[in-house]
């Protein structure tokens, strides 16, 4: 016995973030000695699926013809060779978008901001959520992740940026999600173009603090469920 078998590689095509109803293929790549591949989904009876290897036996395909809520989650795969089962792959997180209606994204006081000033991006959802994600197109670290610490659900989250520099300029979208499954996201908001004028440069800008608020009825129209308590939010760069 020459030690444990190397872990396989797990990935999804066309990617790991899939819109409701679209197809996705999960690939597990092991070694040429593989006889069988197994895919496990967290919190599902194992194995979630088994497949024979495709020639030349070093990988297997797991097909999802139409993405739904049931397929969203965290996966690992294994392969079996004549000497036994491999180590598990690194996890693959398959996220479904389109689980909820799109939030709306606004820039306050305006999407036209002077370098050195402050701007707040406000993401508002139709139904109360406890996680909000802000995406910037073509950014090295595109995801700003706000999650309620206490599970309190909010209709909106604020992403303050101060001081603003030219690096903050670009196209943003936001998503919302429920705590019971962070693998289920809303449709993306309509894009918001943040335009920064002026010449102050700062190569490492970042939002200062991130807060979720429950505005009163006059501040946020149509919160028919009533006001919800303020809660602290953790900020995560991913």
């Amino acid at each position: 016995q020459a030690g444990p078998l190397p872990k396989p590689t797990l990935w999804a095509e066309p990617g790991s973030v899939i819109s409701w109803g679209n197809s996705v293929t999960i690939w597990c790549q092991g070694t040429l000695e593989a006889r069988e591949y197994r895919l496990d989904k967290e919190e599902s009876p194992a194995p979630w699926d088994r497949q024979n290897p495709l020639e030349p036996k070093n990988k297997a395909r797991f097909s999802i013809p139409s993405m739904t809520e049931d397929y969203a989650g965290r996966y690992r795969c294994y392969y079996r060779s004549p000497v036994g089962w491999s180590q598990p792959s690194d996890p693959l997180e398959l996220v479904m978008t389109g689980a909820y209606s799109k939030p709306t994204l606004s820039a306050l006081p305006s999407p036209l901001v002077t370098s050195g000033k402050s701007v707040t991006l406000l993401c508002q959802s139709r139904s109360p959520m406890d996680t909000f994600l802000l995406i910037k197109e073509r950014a090295a670290h595109p995801l700003l992740h706000l999650r309620s610490e206490h599970g309190a659900q909010q209709h909106q989250a604020e992403f303050p940026m101060s001081p603003v520099t030219s690096v903050h300029g670009g196209t943003y979208r936001c998503f919302s999600s429920h705590g019971f499954s962070h693998y289920l996201l809303s449709h993306p908001s309509d894009p918001l173009e943040l335009i920064v004028s002026g010449s102050l440069e700062d190569p490492r800008p970042s939002p200062t603090r991130s807060v979720s608020t429950a505005a009163g009825p006059e501040d946020q129209p149509l919160m028919p469920t009533g006001s919800v308590p303020h809660s602290g939010l953790r900020r995560h760069w991913e």
Partner: antibody
Framework: QVQLVQSGAEVKKPGASVKVSCKAS????????IDWVKQPPGKGLEWIGY????????SYNQKFKGRVTMTVDKSTSTVYMELSSLRSEDTAVYYC??????????WGQGTTVTVSS | DIVMTQSPDSLAVSLGERATINCKSS????????????LAWYQQKPGQAPRLLIY???TRESGVPDRFAGSGSGTDFTLTISSLQAEDVAVYYC?????????FGQGTKLEIK
């Protein structure tokens, strides 16, 4: 594509009840509010209320409260609107519509309800 | 309840000409929280369900021709069809979604002159 398919036309007598269905497909059913809108013949649109399939939460226009009940069957992705104590002024086309952010981005084809003795 | 009033009730415009429909709300639809106007426009052709054209007063729904444009803020809003086509014959409704109950304008019937 998003589709909301409603049940067929109904003719009812005054005092009776009617139950209209709206079957959704082409999207994640549980996460979108479904509203009902009334349109009397040759007239405008009037909001009746909504139901949130995920939780069953409802909210009704005060004008219809006590006479309207909205329910959901998640297993068939169908919502229902029942209107009781029908009167002649309830004669209308009833639409179900999917809410985006309180506005409606998809509509059913409509169900004609005629109340006549 | 917020009352929505459209004008005119009916309108006849020549093909290729501009059509303008107005909508007035009994209170402001501009939110202080996000600086957005909670107003949508719908088109309803004879025998059909309404179709969303515009939301947030000026954002065109996907697939809607760019000859349709929404404008206005606060209590006064306008739907403009820049060059009327035969298929635009319909009744047009504005809707406020600032507060419950959701309310619609009475509709404007658009015909070809």
């Amino acid at each position: 594509q998003v589709q909301l398919v409603q049940s067929g036309a109904e003719v009812k007598k005054p005092g009776a009840s009617v139950k209209v269905s709206c079957k959704a497909s082409g999207y994640s059913f549980s996460g979108f509010y479904i509203d009902w809108v009334k349109q009397p013949p040759g007239k405008g649109l009037e909001w009746i209320g909504y139901i949130f399939p995920s939780s069953g939460e409802t909210s009704y226009n005060q004008k219809f409260k006590g006479r309207v009940t909205m329910t959901v069957d998640k297993s068939t992705s169908t919502v229902y609107m029942e209107l009781s104590s029908l009167r002649s002024e309830d004669t209308a086309v009833y639409y179900c519509a999917r809410q985006a952010f309180y506005y409606f981005d998809s509509w059913g084809q409509g169900t004609t309800v005629t109340v006549s003795s | 309840d917020i009352v929505m009033t459209q004008s005119p009730d009916s309108l006849a415009v020549s093909l290729g000409e501009r059509a303008t429909i107005n909508c007035k709300s009994s209170q402001s639809l501009l939110s202080s929280s996000n600086q957005k106007n909670y107003l949508a426009w719908y088109q309803q052709k004879p025998g059909q369900a309404p179709r969303l054209l515009i939301y947030w007063a000026s954002t065109r729904e996907s697939g809607v021709p760019d000859r349709f444009a929404g404008s206005g803020s606060g209590t006064d809003f306008t739907l403009t069809i820049s060059s009327l086509q035969a298929e635009d014959v319909a009744v047009y409704y504005c809707q406020q979604y600032y507060s419950y109950p959701l309310t619609f304008g009475q509709g404007t019937k658009l015909e070809i002159k």
